[in-house]
C-alpha cells in the first residue's frame, strides 16, 4: 500500500542532492587550503541531520547548529559583499575580486547555492517530489531556515566597510522583506561595522537617474543610521563597464563615472 505523502507547493529536493553537497564540499576544501581540515562526510551527516525525519515546517536554527559548527570559517571581515536580487553580478564581481566574499563564496553558502531540500516527519527519506514554499506553505522550512541562519552569521561577522549590491531595476530597490532587508541589515554589528556602502546597479543603458535618491534607499539609510552605522551609496550606471574596470582598473576609460 503506497504511503500517503504530503504535497507541498514548492519544488522538491534537487536531484542527486546528497552527492551534490558532498562533491561541492570536496571541491571547496581542495581549493581553499585553510578548509582542508574539514571532513566532508561529517559535513554531509550534519547537513542531513538538520532536516531528515523532521517536519519540514518545523525546522529551527538550532537544527543547523552542528552544521554551522563544522562549517565555521574565517573570512576577512572587511571584505564582505552582500547582495539583494542581483546574485549573478555579485558573483561575477567576486570571481574577479577574489579577496572579497559573498555568502556563496564561503563553504556553507557554496554547498547550498541554488539547491532545494526537505525531508518528511518520522521517515529517513528525502522528499524529491515537493518541498514547502515560503509563502504558500510555511516559513520555517529547511531551505529558508538554512539561509536565514547562515545569512545572520555572515552579517554578524562583517566589519569596517560592508558593501551591498542592489538591483536598481526592481520596483523596491531595497526590500525590507528580502534576506538582506530582514536578516542581514539587522545583524550588522555597530561596534564593528563603520559603514554600509550600497552599490545600486542600473539596468537600462540610458538610465542616468540618481537611484541613490530612491525612497527605498532613503529607508535603508534611515534603518542603518538608527543602528549607528554610516551609510553611503553609489550608482553603477553601467554594470558591464563596472566589471570590465574591476578586471582592468588601469584602463583609461575607468577613471570616469561608471
Amino acid at each position: 500500500v503506497p504511503r500517503w505523502r504530503q504535497q507541498w507547493s514548492g519544488p522538491g529536493t534537487t536531484k542527486r542532492f546528497p552527492e551534490t553537497v558532498l562533491a561541492r564540499c570536496v571541491k571547496y576544501t581542495e581549493i581553499h587550503p585553510e578548509m582542508r581540515h574539514v571532513d566532508c562526510q561529517s559535513v554531509w551527516d550534519a547537513f542531513k541531520g538538520a532536516f531528515i525525519s523532521k517536519h519540514p515546517c518545523n525546522i529551527t536554527e538550532e537544527d543547523y547548529q552542528p552544521l554551522m559548527k563544522l562549517g565555521t570559517q574565517t573570512v576577512p571581515c572587511n571584505k564582505i559583499l552582500l547582495w539583494s536580487r542581483i546574485k549573478d553580478l555579485a558573483h561575477q564581481f567576486t570571481q574577479v575580486q577574489r579577496d572579497m566574499f559573498t555568502l556563496e563564496d564561503t563553504l556553507l553558502g557554496y554547498l547550498a547555492d541554488d539547491l532545494t531540500w526537505c525531508g518528511e516527519f518520522n521517515t529517513s527519506k528525502i522528499n524529491y517530489q515537493s518541498c514547502p514554499d515560503w509563502r504558500k506553505d510555511c516559513s520555517n522550512n529547511p531551505v529558508s531556515v538554512f539561509w536565514k541562519t547562515v545569512s545572520r552569521r555572515f552579517a554578524e561577522a562583517a566589519c569596517d566597510v560592508v558593501h551591498v549590491m542592489l538591483n536598481g531595476s526592481r520596483s523596491k530597490i531595497f526590500d525590507k522583506n528580502s534576506t538582506f532587508g530582514s536578516v542581514e541589515v539587522h545583524n550588522l554589528q555597530p561596534e564593528k561595522v563603520q559603514t554600509l556602502e550600497a552599490w545600486v546597479i542600473h539596468g537600462g543603458r540610458e538610465d542616468s537617474r540618481d537611484l541613490c535618491q530612491d525612497p527605498t534607499i532613503k529607508e535603508l539609510e534611515s534603518i542603518i543610521s538608527k543602528r549607528n552605522i554610516q551609510f553611503s551609496c553609489k550608482n553603477i550606471y553601467r554594470p558591464d563597464k563596472f566589471l570590465q574596470c574591476v578586471k582592468n582598473p588601469e584602463d583609461s576609460s575607468c577613471t570616469s563615472e561608471i
Epitope: E30, I31, T94, Q95, V96, R98, D105, E250
Partner: nanobody, 128 residues
C-alpha cells in the same frame, strides 16, 4: 595585463639552495595559476612546478619532486620556487608564467602553450 619579473638566480654549488621569486605587476594576481618552467642550454623548455590561484593545488615534475617547493603570497603579488639539494642538471634559465584560473575550478594543467603571460627568466647555474 600581468607583467612577471623573475629574480633570485645565481651561481651555486651542487647541494646548495636557492629561492626564486616571481613578482607580478598588474591587477588580480590571485586570478592566475603560476607555473615555473626552465630551459637548459640546447634543450626544450620544460615544466618544473605549478600552483593554483589559492595554493590549493600544487604540481611538480618528477625531476624536482621532493627537492623544490612552490608557494605564493597573493598579498605580495609574488610566487616563489624554493630549490634545495641543487644538482648540475638543474642548470637552466628559469621562467615563471601565469594562466587565468576560475575561482571554483581547482584542476589546472600548466602546459607551456596554455600560459598567457611569461617573465624574461632568471639564470640558475649549479657547478659540481
Amino acid at each position: 595585463d600581468v607583467q612577471l619579473q623573475e629574480s633570485g638566480g645565481g651561481l651555486v654549488q651542487a647541494g646548495d639552495s636557492l629561492r626564486l621569486s616571481c613578482a607580478a605587476s598588474g591587477p588580480h594576481f590571485n586570478n592566475y595559476a603560476i607555473g615555473w618552467f626552465r630551459q637548459a642550454p640546447g634543450k626544450e623548455r620544460e615544466f618544473v612546478a605549478g600552483i593554483s590561484w589559492s595554493s590549493g593545488s600544487l604540481l611538480y615534475s618528477d625531476s624536482v619532486k621532493g627537492r623544490f617547493t612552490i608557494s605564493r603570497d597573493n598579498d605580495k603579488n609574488t610566487a616563489y620556487l624554493q630549490m634545495n639539494s641543487l644538482k648540475p642538471e638543474d642548470t637552466a634559465l628559469y621562467y615563471c608564467a601565469a594562466q587565468y584560473q576560475e575561482r571554483y575550478y581547482s584542476d589546472f594543467s600548466l602546459k607551456e602553450k596554455g600560459m598567457e603571460y611569461w617573465g624574461k627568466g632568471t639564470l640558475v647555474t649549479v657547478s659540481s
